[in-house]
Interface confidence: medium
Amino acid sequence: LPEEDDDTINTDSELRPMKPLHTFCAMKAEDGPCKAMIRSYYFNMNSHQCEEFIYGGCRGNKNRFDTLEECRKTCIPGYKKTTIKTTSGAEKPDFCFLEEDPGICRGFMTRYFYNNQSKQCEQFKYGGCLGNSNNFETLEECRNTCEDGGGSGGGLNDIFEAQKIEWHEGGPPHHHHHHHHHH
């Protein structure tokens, strides 16, 4: 992790106390005035996650990273890349302990969350808005961030099919058959 420097700031959040490593981690994503379409990442102070945005290719600010990993290492305190996981349970971010939260929208994106009961990352259906930070696009990303152990991976959570969104089977009252696609 980068050494803390004079750039450090404090902020409060309902989600958890948060102390970004650098002031630029608190800057808003800035796409800049140019028209290139460069997939980049920034640290979102509100969700406390590194998220994707499209960078225009010029200007912008320091809260811009070429990879998700680079963003996390730079801006998330205590973030450790754990491709080879420790059996001793390395310290994990507080958001790993948040309950699965599909949000209120109905996009039905497949995402992964860390289930503190089973101590495993499991699949859930995310609605596409709101929700919380215990929400990962890939199983590997979830495991690397939140799982402790030297487990073999695999198991029931890989085939976890539960559609736990409370409103999943109902559909909206007046249009049951529309489908729209999210990436």
């Epitope: 979102n44 969700s47 596409g128 808005c129 709101l130």
Partner: antibody, heavy 118, light 113 residues
Amino acid sequence: EVQLVESGGGLVQPGGSLRLSCAASGFTFSSYAMSWVRQAPGKGLEWVSAISGSGGSTYYADSVKGRFTISRDNSKNTLYLQMNSLRAEDTAVYYCANNGAAAAWDYWGQGTLVTVSS
Amino acid sequence: QSVLTQPPSLSGAPGQRVTISCTGSSSNLGADYDVQWYQQLPGTAPKLLIFGNNNRPSGVPDRFSGSRSGTSASLAITGLQAEDEANYYCQSYDRSLSGSMVFGGGTKLTVLG
């Protein structure tokens, strides 16, 4: 037929409190997330708060966080908004709406006017 | 200052085609979040017109259509009618705010004549 009927609005002094209710009928209330959206006189729409169908997850706009509390009673098919520490800028018509397709609000109530003034 | 930008007003003659634009950024429309459109007739509650970028709820005439591309979206109304005179709002989700459902400032559509 889906119906949402708000009540509880009125005149309140700055710093005061008010509790809005929204009675729902015509759909399976507990299956739907619900939201409050407000509209200041002559202005545009502003999302205020939302709650999941079970009531287990709640969300707030920054402008009301810490002052407003959204809740629901699924046995009564009713949505609530407890508004504390009210300010003049909270003056608006408050609509309740149900979250149906996508990120949309399918159905809206007729609204209830909250006026914060001394 | 609204997160999504709409023209404050537009006008058109009966029978014409009008398009209302809605411009966002990389954290809302550009991040592939759906856009919705609402119609608010004078003195009434908003009504859902388009959801999920281009889907119409039952009962909404096919004169209304929506589209989204990149950081912009638009609502097209063909065969403009007197009863289309209203305020129109676009709405989406913005991930760079603290979980905010966001609206455009609204467009007042006037039907001439």
